[in-house]
């Protein structure tokens, strides 16, 4: 990485500089680079069973530098470490290993999940969702009058999505079948999604109950719930002639 | 579990000497620079001096330089600093540390005060 | 030599607050930075080196950030146990510099 990796030809004392090569201040045969020019950093280099001496302007992969009043000295870090800060905090670990807390893993310790991308150990992030919206006005093929049996839905909105460990979110959407009194539509009305009709809300003895938006909703059975929501809707049908009533169901 | 333990700590008289040991354990120490580091009363952290790993150098801070001197013995796992000409404004709380471009392990502290 | 100016020198918060150091540095440092803490009668504790990086042990609440000269230690909701003094220190070349301290009280 940047080197100018000064070697001598001729042989001379190592304490001898005329004659080094590239950014070297004294550098022998046997031992290539002693020291360096300003700014330089020094490193040592294996080469077989032999430590060379280099100089260079920033330390190569895997080393880290200290500017020392005399010397600007390449270190070492640790074998599985690319980056280092010293010798005890990594920064950047080699292939195949995740970074964690300035060490190099095999694997990432329990309770966290490696990044692939970024090689580190990170925090498993679960889904977190919103509290349910308002449901919306009781319809039945987009219109809010003309008929009796409709639908109303609710959503929630993500608010952090799941990391490749986390918890999935739940669903988002929910539908429910609701009742609203027989009217016919005025002229215009048709079609017309209407958020001025109140919804009465349902008793006691109603189910509030839903589930996720699902295509089996029609074609589910009647539970014992339900039946007891019909009996009660024929008894206050006479008295609440006037109010649409929102009536939850369980499939 | 790295330990660094200081002792030699005590009252001097301004212009005596006095000799601080540091004994470390827990970690390679003769991979290590060592430094001191010191803490006037009520005041903030400074630098005093650096031994780097095999004792060939040392760096001191320009408030002590010519008076203090720095070795180690890797040996035995020591930090030594002999303080000589010591002046008042050498009172501290001196703390021994392994120094790799930051202090990462730091020793309890010795109290140094001078005064006549 | 390097110098280091630390802001402020003294803080008052209460816990739950969000809290922030600043520490100017007089040349470019790259990310050659430290954070330490300091209890009364203890000796300091490495907090974050590499200007960011949580060392060991630390809470998450703490982080730092910056680079080259200005740098931050923020703590986002102080707990009891971070009321101390905090120090920042240039690693970048010798002679290693301090900053003078902050010492955050209880409001």
């Known amino acids: 990485q940047n080197a100018s990796r000064g070697r001598r030809q001729r042989r001379m004392h190592p304490n001898v500089s005329q004659g080094c090569q590239g950014g070297c201040a004294t550098c022998s045969d046997y031992n290539g680079c002693l020291s360096c020019k300003p700014r330089l950093f020094f490193a040592l280099e294996r080469i077989g069973m032999k430590q060379i001496g280099v100089c260079l302007s920033s330390c190569p992969s895997g080393y880290y530098g200290t500017r020392y009043p005399d010397i600007n000295k390449c270190t070492k870090c640790k074998a599985d470490c690319d980056t280092c800060f010293n010798k005890n905090f990594c920064t950047k670990c080699k292939s195949g290993f995740y970074l964690h807390l300035g060490k190099c893993l095999d694997n990432c310790p329990e309770g966290l999940e490696a990044n692939n991308h970024t090689m580190e150990c990170v925090s498993i992030v679960h889904c977190e969702v919103s509290e349910w919206n308002p449901w919306s006005p009781c319809t039945k093929k987009g219109k809010t009058c003309g008929f009796k049996r409709g639908t109303e839905t609710r959503v929630r909105e993500i608010i952090q999505h799941p990391s490749a460990k986390g918890n999935l979110c739940p669903p988002t959407n929910e539908t429910r079948k609701c009742t609203v009194q027989r009217k016919k539509c005025q002229k215009g009305e048709r079609g017309k999604k209407g958020r001025e009709r109140k919804r009465k809300k349902p008793n006691k003895g109603e189910s509030k109950e839903a589930i996720p938006d699902s295509k089996s909703l029609e074609s589910s059975k009647e539970i014992p719930e339900q039946r007891e929501n019909k009996q009660q809707q024929k008894k206050r049908k006479v008295q609440d002639k006037q109010k649409s009533v929102s009536v939850s169901t369980v499939h | 579990e790295v330990q660094l333990v200081e002792s030699g700590g005590g009252v001097v008289q301004p212009g005596r000497s006095l000799r601080l040991s540091c004994a470390a354990s827990g970690f390679t120490f003769s991979d290590y620079d060592m430094a001191w580091v010191r803490q006037a009363p009520g005041k903030g952290l400074e630098w005093v001096a650096t031994?780097?790993?095999?004792?060939?150098?040392?760096y001191f801070g320009d408030s002590v330089r010519g008076r203090f001197t720095v070795s180690r013995d890797n040996s035995k796992n020591t930090l030594y600093l002999q303080m000589n000409s010591l002046r008042a404004e050498d009172t501290a709380v001196y703390y021994c540390?392994?120094?790799?471009?930051?202090?990462?392990?730091w020793g309890q502290g010795t109290m140094v005060t001078v005064s006549s | 030599d390097i110098q280091m100016t630390q802001s402020p020198s003294s803080l008052s918060a209460s816990v739950g607050d969000r809290v922030t150091i600043t520490c100017l540095v007089s040349?470019?440092?790259?990310?050659?930075f430290v954070w330490y803490q300091q209890k009364p009668g203890k000796s300091p504790k490495l907090l974050i080196y590499a200007a960011s990086r949580l060392q060991d042990g630390v809470p998450s609440r703490f982080s730092g950030s910056g680079s080259g000269t200005d740098f931050t230690l923020t703590i986002s909701s102080l707990q009891p146990e971070d009321f101390a003094t905090y120090y920042c220190q240039q690693s970048y070349k010798y002679p290693p510099t301090f900053g003078q301290g902050t010492k955050l009280e209880i409001k």
């Open positions: 540390t392994a120094h790799d471009r930051s202090f990462d392990y």
């Open positions: 031994i780097i790993y095999d004792g060939s150098r040392a």
């Open positions: 040349e470019d440092i790259s990310n050659d």
